[in-house]
Interface confidence: low
């Protein structure tokens, strides 16, 4: 018996061929011997089966001795043995219809679980193997779960259902709702304006929800909420903002925050959370602020940084073309009795300059000037 696999919602064509290459009488029946369709001369006739409005054939092929049964909008319950009666012959075709669906929604938050459920006809024992957009293979039976979805899991999942050495392939588009970056870091000199941007890694027609930026300043013992906002159809409106610092927020996506001045007391880490309407859980993006200050007090020239720096960062203070004073472990570097000239404070990581600040040291009888 020939086995054909079909996909729920799709169209399947079951073939039936006569030895005579001409239009002759044929009938398609199901396993209960109920007629589905057949012909009377050149007319298509239909029986009382449940498939009535979804069954068809191709009259253009009858003259060649081909009498296909076409079933549209397949349902799991269409799984059955179909019998084609032609020329006193009976051709049996077993049709197995499978469906594969994602749990609740194909738009999932980063970190959530994706469950794919296989609908299969009674008596079948299929195996499923799914390949994620990043090439990982996951296998299972009737249900298949992937925990902790990552941004890279966004895209088309290709799932192959295997039954009786036959395969049917499903493609499911999954959108992982996340910020483009899990974390970002901004380096600023004291007094400069700071721009924080939180671009989303997905696009949807309507986006509604609410968000908040919590900030843990390096110098503070506890974190505090700097701003809360609402999002309605991609329009941003501020609900509440602290007085110090007074953040400004852009009215359109991507989410954009401006801190008027980078000050040492603001250096630290923030966590922006976004709760989307009709979704459980929140999107998160970490943002870090590093602030540099170069000062001269009496006979001491100091360069300091505040905020989350990695162990690979290097802080240096140098006078034009002279040897630099470097600190790898401390977040401050200083020179006593500095020579007159333009001093440069540099924060670098593996040779790449992240932040620089210049300070002019005047001869000892003058006061310093900061450009």
């Amino acid at each position: 018996k020939k086995v054909v696999l079909g996909k729920k919602g799709d169209t399947v064509e079951l073939t039936c061929t006569a030895s005579q290459k001409k239009s002759i009488q044929f009938h398609w029946k199901n396993s209960n011997q109920i007629k589905i369709l057949g012909n009377q001369g050149s007319f298509l006739t239909k029986g009382p089966s449940k498939l009535n409005d979804r069954a068809d054939s191709r009259r253009s092929l009858w003259d060649q001795g081909n009498f296909p049964l076409i079933i549209k909008n397949l349902k799991i319950e269409d799984s059955d043995t179909y019998i084609c009666e032609v020329e006193d012959q009976k051709e049996e075709v077993q049709l197995l219809v499978f469906g594969l669906t994602a749990n609740s929604d194909t738009h999932l938050l980063q970190g959530q679980s994706l469950t794919l459920t296989l609908e299969s006809p009674p008596g079948s024992s299929p195996s499923v193997q799914c390949r994620s957009p990043r090439g990982k293979n996951i296998q299972g039976g009737k249900t298949l779960s992937v925990s902790q979805l990552e941004l890279q899991d966004s895209g088309t999942w290709t799932c192959t259902v295997l039954q009786n050495q036959k395969k049917v392939e499903f493609k499911i588009d999954i959108v992982v709702l996340a910020f483009q970056k899990a974390s970002s870091i901004v380096y600023k000199k004291e007094g400069e304006q700071v721009e924080f941007s939180f671009p989303l890694a997905f696009t949807v027609e309507k986006l509604t929800g609410s968000g908040e930026l919590w900030w843990q300043a390096e110098r503070a013992s506890s974190s505090k909420s700097w701003i809360t906002f609402d999002l309605k159809n991609k329009e941003v409106s501020v609900k509440r903002v602290t007085q110090d610092p007074k953040l400004q927020m852009g009215k359109k996506l991507p989410l954009h925050l401006t801190l008027p001045q980078a000050l040492p007391q603001y250096a630290g880490s923030g966590n922006l959370t976004l709760a989307l309407e009709a979704k459980t859980g929140k999107l998160h993006q970490e943002v870090n602020l590093v602030v540099m200050r170069a000062t001269q007090l009496q006979k001491n020239l100091t360069c300091e940084v505040w905020g989350p720096t990695s162990p690979k960062l290097m802080l240096s203070l140098k006078l034009e073309n002279k040897e630099a004073k470097v600190s790898k472990r401390e977040k401050a570097v200083w020179v006593l009795n500095p020579e007159a000239g333009m001093w440069q404070c540099l924060l670098s990581d593996s040779g790449q300059v992240l932040l620089e600040s210049n300070i002019k040291v005047l001869p000892t009888w003058s006061t310093p000037v900061q450009p």
Partner: antibody, heavy 120, light 113 residues
Framework: QVQLVQSGAEVKKPGASVKVSCKAS????????ITWVRQAPGQGLEWVGW????????GYSQKFQGRVTMTRDTSTSTVYMELSSLRSEDTAVYYC?????????????WGQGTTVTVSS | DIVMTQSPDSLAVSLGERATINCKSS????????????LAWYQQKPGQPPKLLIY???TRESGVPDRFSGSGSGTDFTLTISSLQAEDVAVYYC?????????FGQGTKLEIK
């Protein structure tokens, strides 16, 4: 620092099954998958499959499909690889390994290896 | 499956000299979405598990001496040891992790001439 410690050597008869364990310690929250790789005497490295110690999700090499089962016990941070219907060509050192850096499936942490000998 | 082919199978190099091992994949292991090559190099000494030297084709694992370097993209890759030391005698393997099944090269045995 993550460490992987494997169970001791095994000697099995053809047709039997073997179950090798791999216990993870130190920063196991960084582990998203533990992979099994085997090496027959004097031969190269061969990937067997992987298991996610948190979810239990698995992915097996087609070659071992139907003969290998990978499981985990979250309470002891241990994963297991069971290979059934053993044959002489399954004689090998079986390693568990895991990536802990951002390098996806480039394995920077390896177990010491478990020698499995299949002999009648 | 992606087939990894290393050349040569064995190599003898004098101490202090440069050693070069090649690895070819049957299909590209460059991910356009990450713009990274999913390729790693390992060193294995007798009785020991493999040791990761290089990942993303050219990123050196921490603690690996800088005489080891990886290069190449797409299907052709090279591991270079700029100045061979006695402790570098081992078998070297390349590995792709672009897609399952993960596959390794057959190995290159490096000896001192």
């Amino acid at each position: 620092q993550v460490q992987l410690v494997q169970s001791g050597a095994e000697v099995k008869k053809p047709g039997a099954s073997v179950k090798v364990s791999c216990k993870a310690s130190g920063g196991t929250q960084n582990i998203y998958a533990i992979t099994w790789v085997r090496q027959a005497p004097g031969q190269g490295l061969e990937w067997v499959g992987w298991v996610n110690p948190n979810s239990g999700n698995t992915g097996y090499s087609q070659k071992f499909q139907g003969r290998v089962t990978m499981t985990r016990d979250t309470s002891t941070s241990t994963v297991y690889m069971e290979l059934s219907s053993l044959r002489s060509e399954d004689t090998a050192v079986y390693y568990c390994a895991t990536p802990t850096s951002s390098s996806d499936d480039a394995f920077d942490i390896w177990g010491q290896g478990t020698t499995v000998t299949v002999s009648s | 499956d992606i087939v990894m082919t290393q050349s040569p199978d064995s190599l003898a190099v004098s101490l202090g000299e440069r050693a070069t091992i090649n690895c070819k994949s049957s299909q590209s292991v460059l991910s356009s979405s990450y713009n990274k090559n999913f390729l790693a190099w390992y060193q294995q000494k007798p009785g020991q598990p493999p040791k990761l030297l290089i990942y993303w084709a050219s990123t050196r694992e921490s603690g690996v001496p800088d005489r080891f370097s990886g290069s190449g993209s797409g299907t052709d890759f090279t591991l270079t040891i700029s100045s061979l030391q006695a402790e570098d005698v081992a078998v070297y393997y390349c590995q792709q992790y672009y897609s399952d099944p993960i596959t390794f090269g057959q190995g290159t045995k490096l000896e001192i001439k």
